[in-house]
Interface confidence: low
Amino acid sequence: EPHSLRYNLTVLSWDGSVQSGFLTEVHLDGQPFLRCDRQKCRAKPQGQWAEDVLGNKTWDRETRDLTGNGKDLRMTLAHIKDQKEGLHSLQEIRVCEIHEDNSTRSSQHFYYDGELFLSQNLETKEWTMPQSSRAQTLAMNVRNFLKEDAMKTKTHYHAMHADCLQELRRYLKSGVVLRRTVPPMVNVTRSEASEGNITVTCRASGFYPWNITLSWRQDGVSLSHDTQQWGDVLPDGNGTYQTWVATRICQGEEQRFTCYMEHSGNHSTHPVPSGKVLVLQSHWQ
């Protein structure tokens, strides 16, 4: 999986009038990294991990860059003629990647009201657009606007490609290692519930990447979906993720239940603690 930096900018119009605010979210290697909103942009690192990657001297630079990009996108939205009444959004997603063989990829995508209408490969400068007439109209609109400023057309997108890769390399050199795989810590806890039932909860934390399977099994067989309750897979602020799954079981039958976890090709099972032992911790390697 390549290292990646992804910028997601959104600007809005209301009844044809472009709003002064914008929202930018930056993801580094798929992790929420920076967030910048409204016209008083604050490049807010998303957790301690992001703080560590950025270092304390880069905030002003990130804020300035993101604010400039937001203004550019607002100008682009103002030139879209298809402004109907109500709330509309223009979204620009810019992605650059560095692969393990050191090859690079960069692309840029425009969405209007959530619908993709224009893409560009920032290395080859090749534009693509969906076949729908609405998308084609929007795409021509935006491309014409971008071409109005010849200098911008010639330099802006090359700069976006170069800057994105430069920023990505800078982040990767920050000294905070973005590890490919971090195994989860799995905790199983129990809490007393009513009428002879207990609730058992299996928590996985500190893992990367985010893809994980966590479920309860009875006698080795997965419980049905509707008897389990899942938490979302959420960033924990350290560049890793956390999640949980819970179910209700009859007291005395704890030994029949196990939590099954699968992550990055490794899997393990974790029993329910019995008696007065409330937490069982196991960290597989």
Epitope: P32, L87, H88, V233
Partner: antibody, heavy 117, light 107 residues
Framework: QVQLVESGGDVVQPGRSLRLSCAAS????????IHWVRQAPGKGLEWVAV????????YYADSVKGRFIISRDNSKNTLYLQMNSLRAEDTAVYYC??????????WGQGTMVTVSS | AIQLTQSPSSLSASVGDRVTITCRAS??????LAWYQQKPGKVPKSLIY???SLESGVPSRFSGSGSGTDFTLTISSLQPEDFATYYC?????????FGQGTRLEIK
């Protein structure tokens, strides 16, 4: 036009569960963080929970953490609030709200939840 | 959680008066503050976002100022439709919090 419409409010007994829905129309629902805000009778506004536009991040007020679950179905333009282990102090009008990004300029009309034995 | 304290809790004023409501945050929130107006039985209405930016369609007699921990909502010349309850709200960090409200009544 831009609209949020809540439903699912009811009178329930303490300890029971209830699920609220919020249907969105007139804007690109999947682009927006959506929040639940509540207001107890005669009281002020209290923020309850938020779910990010893509459903990845969720945050809750301490008063509902562990009992309420916020979720969304972007394919249906609908927001949900699953309320478990309800208490008398959860009695309120529940609003869904949104805006670009966190100051709410889009509000639903509210749905009343009464928790009483 | 960041606490917001509004003052006064209630105030009486007359049409044409200049009115100021303050909101103090328990810690710095930059300019991440919004103001809302709510009339009895109605949905809250956004007036100001980012401490000083006027929402679209809101009359220019409403203005907001402040940064960090101290914020102000000012109504330059009260109109009959302005009598309502006003709330401040911080969106600097989760959990989002509201002030307790300021009730503005006719004198």
């Amino acid at each position: 036009q831009v609209q949020l419409v809540e439903s699912g409010g009811d009178v329930v007994q303490p300890g029971r569960s209830l699920r609220l829905s919020c249907a969105a129309s007139g804007f690109t629902f999947s682009n927006y963080n959506i929040h639940w805000v509540r207001q107890a009778p005669g009281k002020g506004l209290e923020w309850v929970a938020v779910i990010r536009y893509d459903g990845i991040n969720k945050y809750y007020a301490d008063s509902v953490k562990g009992r309420f679950i916020i979720s969304r179905d972007n394919s249906k333009n609908t927001l949900y609030l699953q309320m478990n282990s309800l208490r008398a102090e959860d009695t309120a009008v529940y609003y869904c709200a949104s805006g670009p990004p966190d100051a709410f300029n889009i509000w639903g009309q509210g749905t009343m939840v009464t928790v009483s034995s | 959680a960041i606490q917001l304290t509004q003052s006064p809790s209630s105030l009486s004023a007359s049409v044409g008066d200049r009115v100021t409501i303050t909101c103090r945050a328990s810690q710095g929130i930059s300019s991440a503050l919004a103001w809302y107006q709510q009339k009895p039985g109605k949905v809250p209405k956004s007036l100001i976002y980012d401490a000083s930016s006027l929402e679209s369609g809101v009359p220019s007699r409403f203005s907001g100022s402040g940064s960090g921990t101290d914020f102000t909502l000012t109504i330059s010349s009260l109109q009959p439709e302005d009598f309502a309850t006003y709330y401040c709200q911080q969106f600097n960090s989760y959990p989002i919090t509201f002030g307790q409200g300021t009730r503005l009544e006719i004198k």
